[in-house]
């Protein structure tokens, strides 16, 4: 025998108190699939969260973070403070990257400069707290009598720091 609740579409719930009719989800609640026996309460984007997408009878609200913060976790479950480029967030707040490290974003951690010598290259542009070093041609390529000079490697695009 078919469950009468299976006929209840998204946006409704199967109301056992009312002979299993499909009642519309009350305001501030939703059901994203059919056959539900209850509607879920809409997420409220409060405080440091702000509403990116309003709740509806069939879908939950979606939040993002107010300016100066960024999302962390699935579905923006947390908001973390932004820092400036050249900084990382610690338990004591935003701290400048130590010498030899950089951060080119407002989030994430400071990462070590690229070691050009590991690739047999020289440092073309020094690193800063905000930017990685730029590696240039290998010293051998610049020695007298070299038949050709390899053009300097272009500065790489700022990458996304690991989360």
């Amino acid at each position: 025998l078919q469950d009468p609740c299976s006929n209840c579409p998204a946006g409704t719930f199967c109301d056992n108190n009312r002979n299993q009719i499909c009642s519309p989800c009350p305001p501030n609640s939703f059901s994203s699939a059919g056959g539900q026996r209850t509607c879920d309460i809409c997420r409220q984007c409060k405080g440091v969260f702000r509403t990116r997408k309003e709740c509806s009878s069939t879908s939950n609200a979606e939040c993002d973070c107010t300016p100066g913060f960024h999302c962390l976790g699935a579905g923006c479950s947390m908001c973390e403070q932004d820092c400036k480029q050249g900084q990382e967030l610690t338990k004591k707040g935003c701290k400048d990257c130590c010498f030899g490290t950089f951060n080119d974003q407002k989030r994430g951690i400071c990462r070590p400069w690229t070691n050009c010598s590991l690739d047999g290259k020289s440092v073309l542009v020094n690193g800063t707290k905000e930017r990685d070093v730029v590696c240039g041609p290998s010293p051998a390529d610049l020695s007298p009598g070299a038949s050709s000079v390899t053009p300097p490697a272009p500065a790489r695009e700022p990458g996304h720091s690991p989360q």
């Epitope: 006929n7 209840c8 579409p9 998204a10 946006g11 409704t12 109301d15 009312r18 009719i21 499909c22 009642s23 519309p24 989800c25 009350p26 305001p27 309003e54 509806s56 009878s57 069939t58």
Partner: antibody
Framework: EVQLVESGGGLVQPGGSLRLSCAAS?????????PCWVRQAPGKCLEWIGC?????????YDANWTKGRFTISRDNSKNTVYLQMNSLRAEDTAVYYC?????????????WGQGTLVTVSS | DIQMTQSPSSLSASVGDRVTITCQAS??????LAWYQQKPGKAPKLLIY???TLASGVPSRFSGSGSGTDFTLTISSLQPEDFATYYC???????????FGCGTKVTVL
Amino acid sequence: EVQLVESGGGLVQPGGSLRLSCAASGFSFSANYYPCWVRQAPGKCLEWIGCIYGGSSDITYDANWTKGRFTISRDNSKNTVYLQMNSLRAEDTAVYYCARSAWYSGWGGDLWGQGTLVTVSS
Amino acid sequence: DIQMTQSPSSLSASVGDRVTITCQASQSISNRLAWYQQKPGKAPKLLIYSASTLASGVPSRFSGSGSGTDFTLTISSLQPEDFATYYCQSTYYGNDGNAFGCGTKVTVL
């Protein structure tokens, strides 16, 4: 412009039938909206007739007195809701309103048509 | 079935008066109640939903309260444009769940 426009009213003899239409413009019916029919006899109270789910399923909610005589249906491709009225009686004479019942307005009727007059008389 | 009983059925008042209209449901409807204003020859206009939330564009002199079975609409200071008929409606969906009260006509004293 966001509006509801009713049509199909007029004079009908007792025992006759009539189909009223309610065309929505400026928005589309969805699970957030339940189009409803409400009527008001001359000088009388508002009387709820029923509503239909705004999404793709044919779920209707009706006042018990309508059973067997009044049927609500919907054509989503035309963004239109209908009220089929059969076995009409003199006491069905009223202005018939189409209203949009909205989830974000606590299922209150946040948008109403201008109404269409149905007169049942011989 | 849910029945809605409104009182009084009519009242007379003057501009500036505080007006209170009550509505009683025959069973608990939580906060699922709407209030409407209707003027002669016009469609109803939503004033308040979810018992106490003011609809968009409605002046703040209108307020609603109540939950369960007993509800109130208050006009804090009656204005000339407020003379009209006011209806409550259960928005507790389901068959016979959306009944209206029979209205309160507010006229000039």
